[in-house]
């Protein structure tokens, strides 16, 4: 038994036929010693007398509000809730399995940007006697603060004969660092109480993995003279992180009729305009995704082909990013070839994802994960890799990136990747290895030495352990190269001489 909040206790029960249940001792919160009686809920039946009451809790009939009285006056209450465990698994009766992205997904979370603000939601078919309370933190062993509001009913839907209720909650990391590479996941814990049943649900994620931008705004069409083509332009959504030269998006532009089965014209671009063929009765849609990290695509923003007006959304500055005057070269060190570094780091992002594309289908955060991936270098908040830090002195950040590149280059050349099960030299991992080396050499020309970090001795003995470790390393590398790519893109746009 444990205390959920003041005067509310959760009794954990193994739930099987003829289970013995749990012995619970309740103590009346009073200085009084004599003449105390106990009742349950609205019943006037006296269950016992004395300052303590010992009960055997086996089923929901044994749970409820226990009240101690003296001479008709209520002294204190203790609400007992039951948390059922069947076959070693805690019950999940209150919330609906959303089955996306995988089975046993009860909580789903999304973030519109890297500010540390995110929304989680869940579904239930229960309409009454239902309460939720949400807690969150960054990391679990030494948790950093995340503040969550109250869960609210956000939608009601009819599903066949049933009504389905969606609840949501907004949370904000207290000291968010949008430009840093996350090393500890956000933990979200939801306590759910239905009548006398208690359940808890958890989710663990990095903000980068739950990013889903808002749709592009200000979609506009300009027909091209003597052509079937139209120029489509749009802007970054207002809610996306800034500056856009650092937090860049990529876009998918599609011209298609009302039915998904109709023929279409489709093109991908990093710019905020594109040229497509616009058929009568078709519409043009644009959606956005983080340019350097394969999180979710936004919903589509659409405009009909017939009119060449603009879609919903206010006007605002264009989202091509970059903007502003060119900034001075790096103080205290030579400036890197920003554009070359940008191209190579973007290639690294692509390679990192083709080397390990099945990211969403494998949950790598199980036992022992923190030890294996805490050893890899992360681009942290104080490393100067944010836009302001780069402007002040990019050398700190470049040195950190260089250390990471050398570290991962050595890891990819180590027994973890060269041992069984074997990889061929020109697999994406082989290309990744070569590109890491190439970028590190671009950053540190001959005769210029930065200190490098010691490689940890991660030598798994079993092939399956090696395979798991590879996935974890590649997963971590994807996050590292995404930050590096943002740094070089921003540098190329604002710091190139």
């Amino acid at each position: 038994i444990w205390e959920l909040k003041k005067d509310v206790y959760v009794v954990e029960l193994d739930w099987y036929p003829d289970a013995p249940g749990e012995m619970v001792v309740l103590t009346c919160d009073t200085p009084e010693e004599d003449g105390i009686t106990w009742t349950l809920d609205q019943s006037s039946e006296v269950l016992g007398s004395g300052k303590t009451l010992t009960i055997q809790v086996k089923e929901f009939g044994d749970a409820g509000q226990y009240t101690c009285h003296k001479g008709g006056e209520v002294l204190s209450h203790s609400l007992l809730l039951l948390h059922k465990k069947e076959d070693g698994i805690w019950s999940t009766d209150i919330l609906k399995d959303q089955k996306e992205p995988k089975n046993k997904t009860f909580l789903r979370c999304e973030a519109k940007n890297y500010s540390g603000r995110f929304t989680c939601w869940w579904l239930t078919t229960i309409s009454t006697d239902l309460t939720f309370s949400v807690k969150s933190s960054r990391g679990s062993s030494d948790p950093q603060g995340v503040t969550c509001g109250a869960a609210t009913l956000s939608a009601e839907r009819v599903r066949g004969d049933n009504k389905e209720y969606e609840y949501s909650v907004e949370c904000q990391e207290d000291s968010a660092c949008p430009a840093a590479e996350e090393s500890l996941p956000i933990e979200v814990m939801v306590d759910a109480v239905h009548k006398l049943k208690y359940e808890n649900y958890t989710s663990s994620f990095f903000i980068r993995d739950i990013i889903k931008p808002d749709p592009p705004k200000n979609l506009q069409l300009k027909p091209l003279k003597n052509s079937r083509q139209v120029e489509v332009s749009w802007e970054y959504p207002d809610t996306w992180s800034t500056p856009h030269s650092y937090f860049s998006l990529t876009f998918c532009v599609q011209a298609q009729g009302k039915s998904k089965r109709e023929k279409k014209d489709r093109v991908f671009t990093d710019k905020t305009s594109a040229t497509v063929i616009c058929r009568k009765n078709a519409s043009i849609s644009v959606r956005a995704q983080d340019r350097y990290y394969s999180s979710s695509w936004s919903e589509w923003a659409s405009v009909p082909c017939s009119g060449s007006g603009s879609s919903r959304g206010g006007s605002g500055s264009g989202g091509s990013g970059g903007g502003g005057s060119k900034l001075r070269a790096v103080p205290g060190g030579s400036s890197p070839a920003w554009t070359q570094c940008q191209q190579l780091s973007q290639k690294l992002c692509t390679l990192a994802w083709s080397a390990h594309p099945l990211v969403g289908h494998m949950d790598l955060r199980e036992e022992g994960d923190e030890e294996t991936t805490n050893d890899v270098p992360h681009i942290q908040c104080g490393d100067g890799c944010d836009p302001q830090g780069l402007r002040d002195n990019s050398q700190f950040c470049l040195q950190r990136i260089h250390q990471g590149l050398i570290f991962y280059e050595k890891l990819l050349g180590s027994d973890i990747f060269t041992g069984e099960p074997s990889l061929l030299p020109d697999s994406p991992v082989g290309q990744l290895h070569a590109s890491l080396l190439g970028l590190s050499q671009l950053l540190q020309p001959e005769g210029h030495h930065w200190e490098t970090q010691q490689i940890p001795s991660l030598s798994p003995s079993q092939p399956w352990q090696r395979l798991l470790l590879r996935f974890k390393i590649l997963r971590s590398l994807q996050a590292f190269v995404a930050v590096a790519a943002r740094v070089f893109a921003h540098g190329a746009a604002t710091l190139s001489p």
Epitope: R228, Q229, T250, R261, E262, K263, K264, D265, R266, V267, F268, T269, D270, T275, I277, R279, K280, S354
Partner: antibody, heavy 118, light 107 residues
Framework: QVQLVQSGAEVKKPGASVKVSCKAS????????LHWVRQAPGQGLEWMGW????????EYAPKFQGRVTMTTDTSTSTAYMELRSLRSDDTAVYYC???????????WGQGTMVTVSS | EIVMTQSPATLSVSPGERATLSCRAS??????LHWYQQKPGQAPRLLIY???QSISGIPARFSGSGSGTEFTLTISSLQSEDFAVYYC?????????FGGGTKVEIK
């Protein structure tokens, strides 16, 4: 399944015109874009243009503009490509292809060899 | 127009080995890049679309990667039926253009 069957080989004199046909089956003709791509002997692939059978819209590669005409007959589910003022370097295999997506080529015809020789 | 350059022009590989074919665009084309296989006397066949998307019915040994200006087609373990000419094609802008092709031959 989606199939494209092209007309037979042609031999033409320089300055003449050729009209190659491409009969589609296995799908609703107006549901796919149709492209023409050619390949000179021992050479690579060269895109010529596309037509939308639904409305007759066309887009031609600048190299062929003014010399090529693409048409369709929806009643027979057939596409045509006519190339005028033939030169010897127009000797090639001409392919039609169809796709629901405009910018790449999914289903190909078997090709029609056009030889331009005096 | 966008010029597509493929390398090498010829690649000699033994059956069972891995083949890596490169395609470079004269300007950034995002992921608007597609790969085709052509065997002698046959029409080309689409292998990969939008740089890395696989086509149903195409063996899993064919994979694509890249974005921007550099792209790669990888055949993980060459089978006898894979010896052919491979073309890349950009769809970033009209006119649509192809690379000159890479001939994969038996070593």
């Amino acid at each position: 399944q989606v199939q494209l069957v092209q007309s037979g080989a042609e031999v033409k004199k320089p300055g003449a015109s050729v009209k190659v046909s491409c009969k589609a089956s296995g799908y609703t003709f107006t549901d796919y874009y149709l492209h023409w791509v050619r390949q000179a002997p021992g050479q690579g692939l060269e895109w010529m243009g596309w037509i939308d059978p639904e409305n007759g819209d066309t887009e031609y590669a600048p190299k062929f503009q003014g010399r090529v005409t693409m048409t369709t007959d929806t009643s027979t589910s057939t596409a045509y490509m006519e190339l005028r003022s033939l030169r010897s370097d127009d000797t090639a295999v001409y392919y039609c292809n169809a796709n629901k997506e405009l910018r790449y080529f999914d289903v190909w015809g078997q090709g029609t060899m056009v030889t331009v020789s005096s | 127009e966008i010029v597509m350059t493929q390398s090498p022009a010829t690649l000699s590989v033994s059956p069972g080995e891995r083949a890596t074919l490169s395609c470079r665009a004269s300007q950034s084309i995002s992921i608007n890049l597609h790969w085709y296989q052509q065997k002698p006397g046959q029409a080309p066949r689409l292998l990969i679309y939008f740089a890395s998307q696989s086509i149903s019915g195409i063996p899993a040994r064919f994979s694509g990667s890249g974005s921007g200006t550099e792209f790669t087609l990888t055949i993980s373990s060459l089978q006898s039926e894979d010896f052919a000419v491979y073309y890349c094609q950009q769809s970033n802008s009209f006119p649509l253009t192809f690379g000159g092709g890479t001939k994969v031959e038996i070593k």
